[in-house]
Structure formats: structure tokens, C-alpha cells
């Protein structure tokens, strides 16, 4: 640690005195102190000498000697008082800037330590301090206002009693800045804008911050707009608002608008897009396929996206048949607004019944006209199977009817023994019918197919099974001969249309 000569913590001299402060260290040393006049600084070997031959009250202050090469950063200090009977204060700053809740040091340095008992802090023109101002005094450093508040941003003077009268320092301006958490908060309204050419429009860009020192501007396609700014202060925040009013919009007004605000912490920006159109529009679309297939008993949500300007004047879901004249329950229709010009309309169809297959149409209307979007809903069914024994052209024939959607495939199995269902171990023969005859195939209905298996002689201890399957499931019917003439019915007696 460097050593200062004279080796006293403080030195009191009269104006005009010669002061010599010597600092000695192991290596090179350097002096520092407040910016003040009349000092001469010179080196003498390993020491540094700070001297003046004409000390003034302005030389009052703490002078520190450091050893730059010392990794521990050791230093020594001496405080110099130049006691001027006419000047009790040496003020080291015109202005002090701190953040809220920091201690604010007002550097009024007392030039004579004897005066310490009679010092006080006042506001300029003799006004008292604000209530709850908590402060302390150090003759070396000045007055400290503890945990300064924004409201304490004032001009202060230091007062000392000299010969029974108060002598004031020059004033110090205290600026207490709000602690700024980040760039100003921004809003740009609306988030999106559409207008028909000739209509009026308004875009509002506003920014707010706890501190008044911030800038805000609105730009259109990277061109800064000259808009008068409205300023306000409420909820302890400063607000600056820019309002762009357009009486009759045209295509050149369209494009990207950005609201930008900045302060010492950085910059925030937010953007919106303004579309100018020739006339009203109404567009319906869906992310779903308009042709839907759902298994019976399951649920389906039909979703339509609507883009429209001006807003919708009416909309509804309609069931167009073919099964009944029922209409979707309103409680199953749901509308959500994605933003001002885009909406999603959902029709919920839970636990679908056979009578609910068919066409569903969403209709919407605005000044641009009517639009409709129609979904076709076909229900999927697992196959239902039945088998009868009959004679066709004199030949004994097993006739299998399978009904389902999508169209079922048919497979015949012959197996030993009497069983409800042939298993692999019992199977004697398998016949696939690649082209069963389609008996009925109407939109939104089940498809019914028929497959014939000609059997010369029915084996009594055997089972004949017709199996049908599609993407939903499978069904089967096992035919067990009881006697040679068992189950002989005309084919048209078992055919049915669901």
C-alpha cells in the first residue's frame, strides 16, 4: 500500500498556503482527486508529488494515491481542508444524477471541519426539505439523501453557520431517474386493417414508460411519418400517442406500418399490415377435405374459415339431406374470431347416426354477397352378413349378402365340424370372391354386395362361412347344413335394403 506524507488523515491549511503531498510506493504511483485548479504533479524517483503554492477553497477534497501495478489495488488517501472564512463550501458538482432508491451524494465539501456542527441541507431559496427526506452528512463527502425518490428531483443548497449567520453553497441539481425496466411498452391499434378504397381509417401508435425520456414514431413502409404527438401521464407512466387519421384511403396508403419506441434500455417495435381493397369480399375455405368419411358412432367437427370485409351480416349451417329434414342444432355450431377479418366456424357432430350422413352447407353473407361451402359426409359401417341356401338354375347355391361402407370384400370358407366361426385348424377350403355383385350403391348409403357359392352337395358335418371385411371391420355368417333341404329359400326373400 502506498504511503502519503504528511502521514495524517486530514490536513487543514489557509488559503494561499503551499501544500505538498508526497506519495511513495513499491512501484510507480499516481495521484487522483477532484478536478480542481492550481495543482502541479511531478515525479521524483519512486514517489509522486502533488503540490500547489496557492491553495484555494476549491482544493478542498480527498486526494488518493494508488499503485496501478498492485494487483490488490491498494490505495492511501488524505483529505485537505482549505478553510476560507468567506467560502465554507467547495461544491464538486453542478448536478447529481442517480436512479430511484439509490443514495444521492450531494458533494458539498466543508472547507473547515470546525463548522460541521452547524450544517444543514435546504432546497434553493431557503425552502425546507420535502417530508420524509432522510439524509446524513460527512465533512469529507457532503450530504447523502438516502434512498432518493423521483419526487426529490430538486435544486439543493448546503448551509453552514458562520458567526451566527447561515452561509449557502452554490446550488446542486439532483435528478432522480426512474428505474427503467426495459424499452417502452408499445401498442399499435388495430393489429390489422382492411378498408375499401375511399373509406376512412385510423391507426394509433402509443408508447409508455416510467421515465419521460423516450422517443416514439410511426413509419409506413420504412418512411417515418410526421404526426403530432399527444403526451399524457397517468398510472405513474408517461404516455406518448401518435394517431394517423386517413379520411379517404387509397392504394398508396396500404402496406406495413411500424410503431417504434426507444429509450436508454433499447428499442421496441411492433407492426401491422393495412390492406386497401377495391370492393367488399367474402372468402370461405376449409383446411379439411370437403368430402369426409367417418365411422358411424364417432364424432366430427366441420370447420370453415371465413375471410371477410366488411363484417358478416349473417351465417348458418344447413343440412341438405338426403335422410331427413332435421337441421343442425344451434348449440353444436361454434364461431371463433381469429382476428378482425378472419373467423372460424365449427359444426360439431358427436356420435354420428346413420340419418346424419349427407351434405352440410355453411352459408355466410356480407355486403359482398352470399357464399356457401358444402361438405359431403359419408358414414362408414362394418359389414353385416347373412347367408341362405337356394337353387339357381337347378344348382344348389349358398348366397351371401354383405352390407357396409366402404364396399366389403367377400371370402368363403369351408371347414370341418359345426362351428360359429371357422378357425385355421378346421379350414378345408377358402374361396375369395374378387368381384361380388353390387346390389345397391347410393350416395351416403351402405353398399350391398352379393356373392354366390355353388355347392353340388352339402356336406353334413361341415360348416360354410361367408366372411366380409372393409376398413372399418368385418362380419361373418356361418351356414350349417342340418339336412339336404335345409334353409332352402328363394333368394329375394333374404335380400334387404337398409
Amino acid at each position: 500500500i502506498p504511503v502519503i506524507e504528511p502521514s495524517v488523515p486530514e490536513l487543514v491549511v489557509k488559503p494561499g498556503a503551499t501544500v505538498t503531498l508526497r506519495c511513495v510506493g513499491n512501484g510507480s504511483v499516481e495521484w487522483d482527486g477532484p478536478p480542481s485548479p492550481h495543482w502541479t504533479l511531478y515525479s521524483d524517483g519512486s514517489s509522486s508529488i502533488l503540490s500547489t503554492n496557492n491553495a484555494t477553497f476549491q482544493n478542498t477534497g480527498t486526494y488518493r494515491c494508488t499503485e496501478p501495478g498492485d494487483p490488490l489495488g491498494g490505495s492511501a488517501a488524505i483529505h485537505l481542508y482549505v478553510k476560507d472564512p468567506a467560502r465554507p463550501w467547495n461544491v464538486l458538482a453542478q448536478e447529481v444524477v442517480v436512479f430511484e432508491d439509490q443514495d444521492a451524494l450531494l458533494p458539498c465539501l466543508l472547507t473547515d471541519p470546525v463548522l460541521e456542527a452547524g450544517v444543514s441541507l435546504v432546497r434553493v431559496r431557503g425552502r425546507p426539505l420535502m417530508r420524509h427526506t432522510n439524509y446524513s452528512f460527512s465533512p469529507w463527502h457532503g450530504f447523502t439523501i438516502h434512498r432518493a425518490k423521483f419526487i426529490q428531483s430538486q435544486d439543493y443548497q448546503c448551509s453552514a453557520l458562520m458567526g451566527g449567520r447561515k452561509v449557502m453553497s452554490i446550488s446542486i441539481r439532483l435528478k432522480v431517474q426512474k428505474v427503467i425496466p426495459g424499452p417502452p411498452a408499445l401498442t399499435l391499434v388495430p393489429a390489422e386493417l382492411v378498408r375499401i378504397r375511399g373509406e376512412a381509417a385510423q391507426i394509433v401508435c402509443s408508447a409508455s414508460s416510467v421515465d419521460v425520456n423516450f422517443d416514439v414514431f410511426l413509419q409506413h413502409n420504412n418512411t417515418k411519418l410526421a404526426i403530432p404527438q399527444q403526451s399524457d401521464f397517468h398510472n405513474n407512466r408517461y404516455q406518448k400517442v401518435l394517431t394517423l387519421n386517413l379520411d379517404q384511403v387509397d392504394f398508396q396508403h396500404a402496406g406495413n406500418y411500424s410503431c417504434v419506441a426507444s429509450n436508454v434500455q433499447g428499442k421496441h417495435s411492433t407492426s401491422m399490415f393495412f390492406r386497401v381493397v377495391e370492393s367488399a369480399y367474402l372468402n370461405l375455405s376449409s383446411e379439411q377435405n370437403l368430402i369426409q368419411e367417418v365411422t358411424v358412432g364417432e364424432g366430427l367437427n366441420l370447420k370453415v374459415m371465413v375471410e371477410a370485409y366488411p363484417g358478416l351480416q349473417g351465417f348458418n349451417w344447413t343440412y341438405l339431406g338426403p335422410f331427413s329434414d332435421h337441421q343442425p342444432e344451434p348449440k353444436l355450431a361454434n364461431a371463433t374470431t381469429k382476428d378482425t377479418y378472419r373467423h372460424t366456424f365449427t359444426l360439431s357432430l358427436p356420435r354420428l347416426k346413420p340419418s346424419e350422413a349427407g351434405r352440410y352447407s355453411f352459408l355466410a353473407r356480407n355486403p359482398g354477397g352470399w357464399r356457401a361451402l358444402t361438405f359431403e359426409l359419408t358414414l362408414r359401417y362394418p359389414p353385416e352378413v347373412s347367408v341362405i341356401w337356394t337353387f339357381i338354375n337347378g344348382s344348389g347355391t349358398l348366397l351371401c349378402a354383405a352390407s357396409g361402407y366402404p364396399q366389403p370384400n367377400v371370402t368363403w370358407l369351408q371347414c370341418s365340424g359345426h362351428t360359429d366361426r371357422c378357425d385355421e385348424a378346421q379350414v378345408l377350403q377358402v374361396w375369395d370372391d374378387p368381384y361380388p355383385e353390387v346390389l345397391s350403391q347410393e350416395p351416403f348409403h351402405k353398399v350391398t354386395v352379393q356373392s354366390l357359392l355353388t355347392v353340388e352337395t352339402l356336406e353334413h358335418n361341415q360348416t360354410y362361412e361367408c366372411r366380409a371385411h372393409n376398413s372399418v371391420g368385418s362380419g361373418s355368417w356361418a351356414f350349417i347344413p342340418i339336412s339336404a333341404g335345409a334353409h332352402t329359400h328363394p333368394p329375394d326373400e333374404f335380400l334387404f335394403t337398409p
Epitope: 478536478p35 504533479l41 511531478y42
Partner: antibody, heavy 117, light 110 residues
């Protein structure tokens, strides 16, 4: 070794506020006084103001009404704000360490700020 | 207009000695010490002389300063091409309560 680095926008529009930050490394700003100095193109040096870490500042009387020097947003930084700028404020702005008033022993490399619309 | 007055230019040939003057008043040079700064092209100023005649470590002894009354001067002996730079004087000013600078002298090594 103490090093100083100025940062901030190189272009400011007339009537707006010029904002610069000086970052000190290799030493602490909590001792010594620090200073902002500027140099218009092809001209001499001009003192703007002093700063001490406690928040104390002294300004050149010719700029006093427009200038604020304060502690920066992060440790070991101090900042300069000059409001209502005109083309006459176009200059290279330097921050430096000050000892005993006019001994400026460490300087930043300087940053050119142009005031233009 | 700078508070301290310096000649705008000076020149010399390599090896020569050149002197740059700086003139002030009683409120600055008359009552306070003078510091000199060297500014090489495209760089920041660098402390060259402090307290009238003190050289920081690393500054060659070819550079010397002096002060008399309200004037100061910087002398460079054994001029070298790398000395081509702008030189500024500075001092504390009591009436301004801050530092003042000279307008700078451009030194050309011929």
C-alpha cells in the same frame, strides 16, 4: 490496463437526442473522474462534461442546458445524452479518464456521430 | 474559437528541433499547469506531457514541455517521421471551472 470504448448510433436526426455509452474495462469507474470530450471534423477538442461514479457531474457552460451525463445501465458504464442536436454537434465523441482536472491519461478510440436528416 | 491559442501548423525535417507554442490567460495557463496531447492521424489523443514538463512512462525524452507566465511550449528534438501528428495544449480554467484546449497544431515532418 484501463480501456474505454464508446458506443451508440452514428447518425442522429436534427432536434433529436444523441445518446452514447462509454464502457470501461480493466479498471473500475468507482474511482477517478471520467470525462466526455468531442472533436468536430477538422477542428480542435472541446470539453463536454465530467462524471464521478456517485452521480456527480459538471458540464461545459456552453452545453449545460442540453447535456446529461449519468451512470450507465450496467456496471462500469457511463452515458452521455445531448438533446436538441443540430449539424454543429457533428463530431467524434471521446470518453476519457481524468486526473486532477485536465490530465486525461486513458481515452476511448472515439465514435463519429453525424447529425443529419 | 479555442480558449488557448496555438499556431495551426508547424514543420521540420527529420533530426531537427521544433517548438509549438500555446498562449492563454491568467485564469488558465497563468494559474494552472499545462498538459500536452498528441493525436496521430485517425486515432484518439494521447497524453504526452502533464504538469508543464512531466512525461508519462513510455513517452520518449525527445519531448519536453515548459511554461512561463501565461504561455507554454512543447519542444520536440530529433524530429522523426512518426512525430507527424496534431498537438493540443490543455489547462484548467478557473473562470470556466473546467479544462480548456488549444485549437491544435498540425506538425508536418518534411
Amino acid at each position: 490496463q484501463v480501456q474505454l470504448q464508446e458506443s451508440g448510433p452514428g447518425l442522429v436526426k436534427p432536434s433529436e437526442t444523441l445518446s452514447l455509452t462509454c464502457t470501461v474495462s480493466g479498471g473500475s469507474i468507482s474511482s477517478y473522474y471520467w470525462i466526455w470530450i468531442r472533436q468536430p471534423p477538422g477542428k480542435g477538442l472541446e470539453w463536454i462534461g465530467y462524471f464521478y461514479y456517485s452521480g456527480s457531474t459538471n458540464y461545459n457552460p456552453s452545453l449545460k442546458s442540453r447535456v446529461t451525463i449519468s451512470v450507465g445501465t450496467s456496471k462500469n458504464q457511463f452515458s452521455l445524452k445531448l438533446s436538441s442536436v443540430t449539424a454543429a454537434d457533428t463530431a467524434v465523441y471521446y470518453c476519457a479518464r481524468s486526473r486532477l482536472g485536465s490530465i486525461f491519461d486513458y481515452w476511448g478510440q472515439g465514435t463519429l456521430v453525424t447529425v443529419s436528416s | 474559437q479555442s480558449v488557448l491559442t496555438q499556431p495551426p501548423s508547424a514543420s521540420g525535417t527529420p533530426g531537427q528541433r521544433v517548438t509549438i507554442s500555446c498562449s492563454g490567460s491568467s485564469s488558465n495557463i497563468g494559474s494552472n499547469t499545462v498538459n500536452w496531447y498528441q493525436q496521430l492521424p485517425g486515432t484518439a489523443p494521447k497524453l504526452l506531457i502533464y504538469s508543464n514538463n512531466q512525461r508519462p512512462s513510455g513517452v520518449p525524452d525527445r519531448f519536453s514541455g515548459s511554461k512561463s507566465g501565461t504561455s507554454a511550449s512543447l519542444a520536440i528534438s530529433g524530429l522523426q517521421s512518426e512525430d507527424e501528428a496534431d498537438y493540443y495544449c490543455a489547462a484548467w480554467d478557473d473562470s470556466l471551472n473546467g479544462p480548456v484546449f488549444g485549437g491544435g497544431t498540425k506538425l508536418t515532418v518534411l
